[in-house]
């Protein structure tokens, strides 16, 4: 029987700044039963605060509602690990709320084979971006990645789309059905999940770009 | 603690390319971006470049652009700088360094010189 | 790019006396979300360079308290208020409110 080992925060995710949740790992629990808390202050202030939630994001995590939750304050934080034998403390983790945004995925992708008379076929892709980020504030820039395949293809054909959300894609298989999707990230954060899938048939008559 | 060991001094030709390495120990390599900070024999400090581990997402230095390549390995933790087209002016100690979940560089690795001479 | 300017080039100061960096930048350094993100690193002789202040006004962990960040805008100052034998080396400011992110020239610190 040990005191326990010393744990880690490895994560913090926020989806749309106003709110955000921190994970850590457990270290060795020592052959009995731990507690673990989670302390935090903000820059500027010396005054330890304790985790307000630790149910929200579920086991060996840390949920800072909207009240709790500031932009403009770096969050110092570290998790205390007690069993019957001692206490052991995480290093010390800086959190800036900017800097660990992941957003959900943008929202109503449309996909649709557009052919001019005039000019080779495309495939148009047009979506918008997810609802709980605030693009008026202007320091949210969110950038976005598209792929698709073939129906039956293992790889992914990935193309990257800045900041606009919508995208033209030449070279296609005709005939072929194709899964499309999009992702987001801001400038410094993490990308969101990819959106469901949406399906398009290419047409037989498709002309494959040269 | 948390670590950053990076690779030992190379001494390069003009017109080839060094890859530098730094491997990190002590905590989720995934977790935290890398940054590469250069600094010229008696001169101050230059950004080169950023890496996410987790996805391997990189921004550079515009300056560099084309001639730095940023990747990192998560099976070994250790991210790596790349430079082509080596210069004298290239002459420096390469340092990587590790932010929290911040945007300032909180651990830094002991520097790897790289000497660019014909 | 954003320059960063900082005086004096170098220092000597007198061990228990107070002393004074300045930075200037060419451009603001309040980000979009409100932040100022510029730090202040030293450099000791022959070590890699370490962080003192974070935006503008925070000691990092371990930092003495000797050790003080101030400005807004454009200008900034980092103060040691009784300076120590062991506080010698160059000091950086840098900011990271714009890519890329920039340093200043630095400023050698030593001891009389």
């Known amino acids: 029987q040990l005191p326990p080992g010393k744990p880690e925060i490895f994560k913090c995710r926020s989806p749309n700044k106003e709110t955000f949740t921190c994970w850590w790992r457990p270290g060795t629990d020592g052959g009995l039963p731990t507690n673990y808390s989670l302390t935090y202050h903000r820059e500027g202030e010396t005054l330890m605060h304790e985790c307000p939630d630790y149910i929200t994001g579920g086991p060996n995590s840390c949920h800072f509602g909207k009240q709790y939750t500031s932009m403009w304050r770096t969050y110092i934080m570290m998790v205390n690990a007690t069993n019957q034998m001692g206490s052991s403390f995480s290093d010390e983790l800086y959190v800036d709320v900017t800097y660990i945004v992941q957003p959900d995925p943008p929202l109503e992708l449309a996909v649709e084979v557009k052919q001019p008379e005039d000019r080779k076929p495309y495939l148009w892709i047009k979506w918008s971006p997810p609802t709980l980020i605030d693009l008026k504030t202007g320091w949210f820039t969110l950038l976005y990645e598209i792929r698709l395949k073939p129906e039956k293809a293992a790889e992914w054909e990935i193309h990257f789309a800045g900041q606009q959300t919508e995208f033209k894609i030449l070279s296609l298989h005709p005939g072929q059905k194709y899964l499309v999707q999009v992702r987001c990230k801001p400038d410094h954060g993490y990308w969101s999940a990819w959106s469901p899938a949406t399906f398009i048939q290419i047409p037989s008559d498709f002309t494959m770009n040269d | 603690q948390v670590q950053l060991v990076q690779s030992g001094a190379e001494v390069k030709k003009p017109g080839s390319s060094v890859k530098v390495s730094c491997k990190a120990s002590?905590?989720?390599?995934?977790?935290?971006?890398i940054h590469w900070v250069r600094q010229a024999p008696g001169q101050g400090l230059e950004w080169m470049g950023e890496i996410d581990p987790s996805d391997s997402y990189t921004n550079y230095n515009q300056k560099f652009k084309g001639r730095v390549t940023i990747t990192a390995d998560k099976s070994t933790s250790t991210a790596y700088m790349e430079l082509s087209s080596l210069r004298s002016e290239d002459t420096a100690v390469y340092y990587c360094?590790?932010?929290?979940?911040?945007?300032?560089?909180?651990?830094w690795g002991q520097g790897t010189l790289v000497t660019v001479s014909s | 790019d954003v320059v960063m300017t900082q005086t004096p080039l170098s220092l000597s100061v007198t061990p228990g006396q107070p002393a004074s960096i300045s930075c200037r930048s060419s451009?603001?350094?309040?980000?979009?979300?409100?932040?100022?993100?510029l730090h202040w690193y030293l450099q000791k002789p022959g070590q890699s360079p370490q962080l003192l202040i974070y935006?503008?006004?925070n000691r990092f962990s371990g930092v003495p308290d000797r050790f003080s960040g101030s400005g807004s805008g454009t200008d900034f100052t980092l103060k040691i208020s009784r300076v120590e034998a062991e506080d010698v080396g160059v000091y950086f400011c840098?900011?990271?409110?714009?890519?890329?992110?920039?340093f200043g020239g630095g400023t050698k610190v030593e001891i009389k």
């Open positions: 360094a590790r932010s929290f979940f911040t945007n300032w560089f909180a651990y």
């Open positions: 451009q603001s350094l309040v980000h979009s979300n409100g932040n100022t993100y």
């Open positions: 840098s900011q990271s409110t714009h890519v890329p992110f920039t």
């Open positions: 935006k503008v006004s």
């Open positions: 002590g905590y989720t390599f995934t977790s935290y971006w």
